[in-house]
């Protein structure tokens, strides 16, 4: 793993509100050179958020993750906390980003060993959570609305940085062996697909309970199925922003070297997700223009439907 200079490549000016530790898989500090200290939290869906290390919930979360890491290591796995340099596992693909966050990938950073190829499900369902698509908008027209944002501050404040791209399309989790993370949880996503015993035509996936404590974060081997983007419905609740890539092949070859700088534009901060079933299939987007948060949603089969008052809105129609 390349540990380059300590130049600050993530700037956090807005910190996230509480996230349950149950849904966190990894944390690390930003670089000392960033000035303002922050903890970068990674969620189970590989979204990154800035958090204030002085907040009690952040301290508790880090302590919990440390214990989990220790337990996993005892079980023969590895789990990285990685204090210091902040790097995506693969690429800072056009995932969500807050207007208060600036991510500057190093031009000489390692390139991803994986190229994202989301399915049509991903395209239609979730600009909100697809690693390859901006988080600023999300599909609508279904019956399941986003949950109410936290009331005390008018909803969670956004700090999402970027997501880690999907790895493969099927998963079978064996019940006998511990689900080991990769050699480095914060390195290239050279994760091997879990051995599948399912006929792909059945569209089935299997999960068995392994032995390690709480299935301690098996994040080195997160496997995405069928171009999944599991939670589009809340992707807007933290004022996430769609990045504006500095090059034109917006979905191709998202290696760190391909993005000289990332800036953001604000978009609507609430939305309702697509709840319509979508046919699975292969879809490899090759956009010819940069992806802006204000892009025409029809191009990707979504409809932007802001919910001005999520507290009052019912979650189902």
């Amino acid at each position: 793993q390349h540990h380059g200079v300590t130049k600050c490549n993530i700037t956090c000016s807005k910190m996230t509100s509480k996230i349950p530790v149950a849904l966190l898989i990894h944390y690390q500090q930003n670089q000392a050179s960033c000035g303002k200290r922050a903890i970068i939290l990674e969620t189970r869906q590989h979204r990154l958020f800035c958090a204030d290390p002085k907040e009690q919930w952040v301290k508790d979360a880090m302590q919990h993750l440390d214990r989990q890491a220790a337990a996993l290591t005892r079980n023969g796995g590895t789990f990285e906390k990685q204090i210091g340099e902040v790097k995506p596992r693969t690429t800072p693909a056009a995932g969500g980003m807050d207007e208060s966050v600036v991510l500057e990938p190093e031009a000489t950073g390692e390139s991803s060993s994986l190229e994202p190829t989301p399915s049509s499900q991903e395209a239609q369902r979730a600009l909100g959570t697809s690693p390859e698509l901006p988080t600023g908008v999300t599909g609508s027209s279904g019956t399941r609305l986003p949950p109410t944002p936290k009331a005390q501050d008018g909803g969670p404040v956004g700090t999402e940085l970027f997501r880690v791209p999907p790895v493969s399309t099927a998963a079978t989790w064996q019940s006998s062996a511990p689900h080991q993370p990769g050699p480095s949880l914060w390195a290239e996503a050279k994760t091997s697909e879990a051995p599948s015993t399912q006929d792909p035509s059945t569209q089935a996936s299997t999960a068995s309970s392994p032995a390690p404590e709480e299935n301690a974060p098996s994040e080195g081997q997160r496997v995405w199925g069928q171009g999944q983007s599991p939670r589009p419905e809340n992707s807007l609740e933290r004022e996430e922003m769609g990045p504006v890539p500095a090059h034109t092949d917006a979905f191709q070859d998202w290696g760190p070297g391909s993005m000289a700088h990332v800036s953001v534009v604000p978009v609507s901060s609430e939305g309702t997700p697509s709840r319509e079933p979508v046919a699975s299939g292969s879809w490899t987007p090759k956009a010819e223009e940069p992806i802006h948060a204000t892009m025409d949603p029809q191009r990707l089969g979504v409809l932007i439907t802001p919910v001005p008052d999520a507290q009052a809105a019912t979650r189902r129609q």
Partner: antibody
């Protein structure tokens, strides 16, 4: 309307395996985590594990480790929970439930199946 | 694991009464708490979640309070349909755990 419909009651012998189904409708099946919750007679609720159909590795309650398998058939929007090496204390009602929240909010369970009663008896 | 201790385990009250059920966590759960109502032979029903947010369709007579490790569910004026068993659930950390339940009976 979101609905989770579970399979019917089961009677099994100790040592056997049971497979309970949970058919989802009214939402995009692959977008939401499915959880399984056990409720033994006269007892409280116990979370067994989560899984998102066809995707991330599951997470299980340590108490059920090695005995639970969760599968999902996306063509029929059905999740399955298989419990092996059954013993009498597995006699319970088993619920599937979904958590509607993004990972920034957490897993509370807003939709539940009607429950499947499992009786383990020799 | 975080243990959830609910009290009382049973409670008798009359229609119109104000009742309070408490839930204590063995560690900080940072307000990631949900309350459920369960009637015999039925699945639990979500009442409140994170930061005491009322779930969809739940009457406003139900409210929650608390922080840190101590939380309370209050029913301001009991209605006949409120007689049921109530459970709290923490979802700060896995394994998610529920309280032992409070059975609310008609006096």
């Amino acid at each position: 309307e979101v609905q989770l419909v579970q399979s019917g009651a089961e009677v099994k012998k100790p040592g056997a395996t049971v497979k309970i189904s949970c058919k989802a409708s009214g939402y995009t099946f692959t977008n939401y985590y499915i959880h399984w919750v056990q409720q033994a007679p006269g007892k409280g609720l116990e979370w067994m594990g989560w899984f998102i159909p066809g995707s991330d590795p599951p997470k299980f309650n340590e108490r059920f480790k090695g005995r639970v398998t969760i599968t999902a058939d996306k063509s029929t929007n059905t999740a399955y929970m298989e419990l092996s090496s059954l013993r009498s204390e597995d006699t319970a009602v088993y619920y599937c439930a979904t958590s509607p929240t993004d990972e920034t909010q957490g897993d509370y369970f807003d939709y539940w199946g009607q429950g499947t009663t499992l009786t383990v008896s020799s | 694991d975080i243990q959830m201790t609910q009290s009382p385990s049973s409670l008798s009250a009359s229609v119109g009464d104000r009742v309070t059920i408490t839930c204590r966590a063995s560690g900080r759960i940072h307000d990631f708490l949900a309350w459920y109502q369960q009637k015999p032979g039925k699945a639990p029903k979500l009442l409140l979640y994170t930061d005491n947010t009322l779930a969809e369709g739940v009457p406003s007579r139900f409210s929650g309070s608390g922080s840190g490790t101590d939380y309370t569910l209050t029913i301001s004026s009991l209605q006949p349909e409120d007689f049921a068993t109530y459970y709290c659930q923490q979802f700060w950390s896995t394994p998610y755990t529920f309280g032992g339940g409070t059975k609310l009976e008609i006096k």
